[in-house]
Amino acid sequence: NQDLPVIKCVLINHKNNDSSVGKSSSYPMVSESPEDLGCALRPQSSGTVYEAAAVEVDVSASITLQVLVDAPGNISCLWVFKHSSLNCQPHFDLQNRGVVSMVILKMTETQAGEYLLFIQSEATNYTILFTVSIRNTLLYTLRRPYFRKMENQDALVCISESVPEPIVEWVLCDSQGESCKEESPAVVKKEEKVLHELFGTDIRCCARNELGRECTRLFTIDLNQTPQTTLPQLFLKVGEPLWIRCKAVHVNHGFGLTWELENKALEEGNYFEMSTYSTNRTMIRILFAFVSSVARNDTGYYTCSSSKHPSQSALVTIVEKGFINATNSSEDYEIDQYEEFCFSVRFKAYPQIRCTWTFSRKSFPCEQKGLDNGYSISKFCNHKHQPGEYIFHAENDDAQFTKMFTLNIRRKPQVLAEASASQASCFSDGYPLPSWTWKKCSDKSPNCTEEITEGVWNRKANRKVFGQWVSSSTLNMSEAIKGFLVKCCAYNSLGTSCETILLNSPGPFPFIQDNIS
């Protein structure tokens, strides 16, 4: 054992910015720090075989498999992958260790498998085995967190049954409204599963992993706040846990809180109370109503009453299946070139949706905001005044929803012209869609006022540029106009544009553009 070389096997993960295929290399790219793969002599194997811990990488990842050999003298080597030999160029690092690397760029299924490295040193021969597979991301999930009471303690545990294991954090805020936005200084984040401080104004739990981030807010009725104009509504699916927090502050401890469902007191074991004194010596009480797994009969009005505050209620609706309620009829908008405008979709959904806005095959992030009436709204303002079709798509575990919008930008026409031996064509993109006129310029009509009506064919093209209709007009050439200058004009309510064409033999044509407002 003492005579064997000290072998270190490492994996280096690279930031993806290259696209060649696997190659043996001694100079890897800019990368993360090397990760030890615990290379060890494989038990009961004939010959000296070292094995590295199995490696699982994402598809398209770029990695380097590297071996560092602490052995005297020169080494020679050979990589073998799927019965093919690959060139191997060892070099020596600053500690005089032999370094052999295999770079795999943009990992694909064909590059997954066993990589064998044969090393010959002055003292001995040995083999190093790497096994590389592609991680099955189809098994990844990210589930919305839910709450459980911690046994024997007044604390909440946040649970998200996700793969890979998510990082769970509590997001706490003691201000009202807008100042509780995610990046506000009023927001405190605690990266732990258990929360003991349950008196805050706004309490959310978030779980994040490779798939993104999902959050759940602790539904709260605050008896010191003016009730909303519409009754707050909480949706849950059968089997999910119900948690409602009732919070009240009073000048002293002489008050109590109770929960009722449809005028019947909640059973013991379905609520627990906590109280504390705030900094100004007022008493804060909170009373949790909870059901570990809801059934249809848990639907109803949950009312929190206090001996010193007006009572407030929330409607809890238990559904068999999630839903997305919104009007899916398509909407058309017409705006001026510099007018401020946002698309918006108002919807009611449970569980919370994931959504995207799409334009010209490009997806944009989607933000949603809860409204006081139980509805949510998603707005999209980043259209940069590009006309075309915009698509809002939303989905949750049980439902999907798509809504189409068309944006038209009011604009004076811009004319482009082209000509061939037999015809002249003009194109324009203005909105509203322009109308066309053709005029002939001659000695009799130097200002090009003589209108051409014969041989003109107008059409609204079915192709779109950035989702925008292009209108065109074509003039078939006749002997009567050959050799003359003609002018095509496109006009709409915002103005007119013209282009002048010399009709002669085919070839490049001089076009003179006129812009007439």
Epitope: G38, R42, Q44, A53
Partner: antibody
């Protein structure tokens, strides 16, 4: 250089929850198939295995302590966290974390590298 | 759970002696057994894995043998630095289990 380091409170009261963090460097649970275990050793007594977490997030727990243990990992921070609820003076021990590589040909070399350990005393 | 019974629980020996420590598993664990050495106030250090494979950097006086349920750790010629406590660990199935140790003392 592969290292593991345990951290957490040195003193906890009975009935409280103990949270220990194992911070490691030189390897990761992101790409290599590796696992990290927690092991404890009461003063002058035997080693007792507590829990293990695999790189794919599977977990395994000691039969006798299963109801009180939770193991989790934060790959981005290179940390594995152990919580042990409802602490009792008999839980006084040195707590170690250790790494276990997994090899594709179906063998394992058990724990090849250990942390130095952290002593936890349970007393009121 | 698989029980690991280690014997003896302690033993006295002199420098140069040949020492054997035994570990018995309550069921077949193939060769999924490792031996560890622990010195006071330190973490355990792996000596042998897969029942008989010597850890890189560990002196060749240490050897392991056995398969199934009976395993032995042998130190062919004790050195002063070998006085410590030795543990076996089965990692054939979860929950993992350690033997309760053999304390090797100077005679």
């Amino acid at each position: 250089q592969v290292t593991l380091k345990e951290s957490g409170p040195t003193l906890v009261k009975p009935t409280e929850t103990l949270t220990l963090t194992c911070t490691f460097s030189g390897f990761s649970l992101r790409y290599a198939r590796m696992g990290v275990s927690w092991i404890r050793q009461p003063p002058g007594k035997c080693l007792e295995w507590l829990a293990h977490i695999f790189s794919n997030d599977e977990k395994s727990y000691s039969t006798s302590l299963k109801s009180r243990l939770t193991i989790s990992k934060d790959t981005s921070k290179s940390q594995v966290v152990l919580t042990l609820t409802n602490m009792d003076p008999v839980d006084t021990a040195t707590y170690f974390c250790a790494r276990m590589p997994e090899y594709s040909s179906g063998w394992s070399g058990a724990f090849d590298i250990w942390g130095q350990g952290t002593m936890v005393t349970v007393s009121s | 759970d698989i029980q690991m019974t280690q014997s003896p629980s302690s033993l006295s020996a002199s420098v140069g002696d040949r020492v054997t420590i035994t570990c018995r598993a309550s069921q077949d664990i193939r060769n999924d057994l490792a031996w560890y050495q622990q010195k006071p106030g330190k973490a355990p250090k792996r000596l042998i894995y897969a029942a008989s494979s010597l850890q890189s950097g560990v002196p060749s006086r240490f050897s392991g043998s056995g398969s199934g349920t009976e395993f032995t750790l042998t130190i062919s010629s004790l050195q002063p630095e070998d006085f410590a406590t030795y543990y076996c660990l089965q990692h054939n199935s979860y929950p993992l289990t350690f033997g309760c140790g053999t304390k090797l003392e100077i005679k």
